[in-house]
């Protein structure tokens, strides 16, 4: 679970653990549950009162190379008449995920874990009203 | 794996794809430090499809703690503050990558794992099935 900082890596660990040089960790990037499919309700991005679009970002030095980002279509929310109601706000919902970054330094290659913030979808919220004195 | 552009001056022996196993620096880089993430919010309470958060703990996973959303209602909150069952609160789910200790309990050996998490909820128009 937890990842120690570089150095001070003495462990009385089980013999079955692979040897790892100090300051790094062994990472198998063959993904467990690779073929798992999201069983999200159908077309919720279009049926939501705070609808969103998807954009695929692609980076060849990142694993996985494709990361999908959502963007809210409107500032307001869609009412029962299908019109935008600007008394309510469409806001993004975000989640962190891990990716592996490949870095080139001269002819040598190193790998770095990276936290990436993904916008997953949008929700409709009542706005916070700031009263001016 | 994915193809990596190679420095033309480097030897050709380098694999263009990500290898199956890599040695990774222990320090995690945070790509979000210069952004202004909106995740720090009280949307869970202000949403028309509010949700509660549950602390999902797994010591063999990194991160070991993930907060998961559960929609509070089947319907959505209307302008009067009541639950409107003509609309549905549904979870917004996302596949994220985490690290799984492999072999189990090993401190510095991991495998990537894809998991499905519920991040929040959104209010949708229901799909109406007409019975013939």
């Amino acid at each position: 679970r937890k990842i120690p900082k570089v150095g001070h890596t003495f462990f009385q660990k089980p013999e079955s653990c692979p040897p790892v040089p100090g300051g790094s960790m062994k990472l198998d990037i063959g993904i467990i549950n690779e073929n798992q499919r999201v069983s999200m309700s159908r077309n919720i991005e279009s049926r939501s009162t705070s609808p969103w679009n998807y954009t695929v970002t692609w980076d060849p030095n990142r694993y996985p190379s494709e990361v999908v980002q959502a963007q809210c279509r409107n500032l307001g929310c869609i009412n029962a008449q299908g019109k935008e109601d600007i008394s309510m706000n469409s806001v993004p919902i975000q989640q962190e995920t891990l990716v592996v970054r490949r870095k080139h330094q001269g002819c040598s290659v190193s790998f770095q874990l990276e936290k990436v913030l993904v916008t997953v979808g949008c929700t409709c919220v009542t706005p916070v009203i700031h009263h001016v004195q | 794996g994915i193809t990596i552009p190679r420095n033309p001056g480097c030897p050709n022996s380098e694999d263009k794809n990500f290898p199956r196993t890599v040695m990774v620096n222990l320090n995690i880089h945070n790509r979000n430090t210069n952004t202004n993430p909106k995740r720090s919010s009280d949307y869970y309470n202000r949403s028309t499809s509010p949700w509660n958060l549950h602390r999902n703990e797994d010591p063999e996973r990194y991160p070991s703690v993930i907060w998961e959303a559960k929609c509070r209602h089947l319907g959505c909150i209307n302008a009067d503050g009541n639950v409107d069952y003509h609309m549905n609160s549904v979870p917004i789910q996302q596949e994220i990558l985490v690290l799984r200790r492999e072999p189990p309990h090993c401190p510095n050996s991991f495998r990537l794992e894809k998991i499905l998490v519920s991040v929040g909820c959104t209010c949708v128009t229901p799909i109406v099935h007409h019975v013939a």
Epitope: R1, K2, I3, P4, H8, T9, F10, F11, K115 | I28, R39, S40, S41, D42, Y44, N45, N52, L53, H54, R55, E57, P59, Y62, P63, S64, V65, W67, R101, H105, P107
Partner: antibody
Framework: QVQLQQSGAELVRPGASVKLSCKAL????????FHWVKQTPVHGLEWIGV????????AYNQNFRDKATLTADKSSSTAYMELSSLTSEDSGVYYC????????????WGQGTALTVSS | NIVMTQTPKFLLVSPGDRVTITCKAS??????VGWFQQKPGQSPKLLIY???NRYTGVPDRFTGSGYGTDFTFTVNTVQAEDLAVYFC?????????FGGGTKLELK
């Protein structure tokens, strides 16, 4: 630098409630979990529960579920713990502590709030 | 709940001594153990995290080791300012639990 400033000592009557505060300084309040820990000579250090100010989520030690309520106010970067139906057993020093969810350890602690429940 | 059994409860030391404190978990907690120092009237201060990693600014006379259920904390060449209570703590699974503490006292 990072600091967790806790409210001052409290002397309260049995049956009453008290709300302890912990103000975060020197970092983004919503990025880390806040945990609360009780210390007494008899039971030592006991983990009470956690709140994530970023998403409002809470989790409790079953032993404190009916005793403590954790809240957070982002506008003032302050975490609160309300203790209800107080008895002499609730006397002790209460600490707030910051937990790094990714790295997985408690790094900074508040100075503690001494609570005395006595008639 | 995971029980952390810490021994000894008291240690009589002289400056320059090497002292060792042990902590035994009632079930495996992998490397998820921290060690804290607490002086009278102060809050606990993190010394070691993940069983063996010194926290920023902690002198290298403080070391930790262990894995699974058995953990050891050592102070090499005890100094006067090290007289305090030391606690182990597991954050492998909640409710997070602490050892009973070891008080270092002057001989």
């Amino acid at each position: 630098q990072v600091q967790l400033q806790q409210s001052g000592a409290e002397l309260v009557r049995p049956g009453a409630s008290v709300k302890l505060s912990c103000k975060a300084l020197g970092y983004t309040f919503t990025d880390y979990e806040f945990h609360w820990v009780k210390q007494t000579p008899v039971h030592g250090l006991e983990w009470i529960g956690v709140i994530h100010p970023g998403n409002g989520g809470t989790a409790y030690n079953q032993n404190f579920r009916d005793k403590a309520t954790l809240t957070a106010d982002k506008s003032s970067s302050t975490a609160y713990m309300e203790l209800s139906s107080l008895t002499s057993e609730d006397s002790g020093v209460y600490y707030c502590t910051r937990f790094l969810t990714y790295e997985g350890y408690f790094d900074y602690w508040g100075q503690g709030t001494a609570l005395t429940v006595s008639s | 709940n995971i029980v952390m059994t810490q021994t000894p409860k008291f240690l009589l030391v002289s400056p320059g001594d090497r002292v060792t404190i042990t902590c035994k978990a009632s079930q495996s907690v992998s490397i998820d153990v921290g060690w804290f120092q607490q002086k009278p009237g102060q809050s606990p201060k993190l010394l070691i995290y993940h069983a063996s990693n010194r926290y920023t600014g902690v002198p290298d006379r403080f070391t930790g080791s262990g894995y699974g259920t058995d953990f050891t904390f050592t102070v090499n060449t005890v100094q006067a300012e090290d007289l305090a209570v030391y606690f182990c703590q597991q954050d492998y699974s909640s409710p997070y639990t602490f050892g009973g503490g070891t008080k270092l006292e002057l001989k």
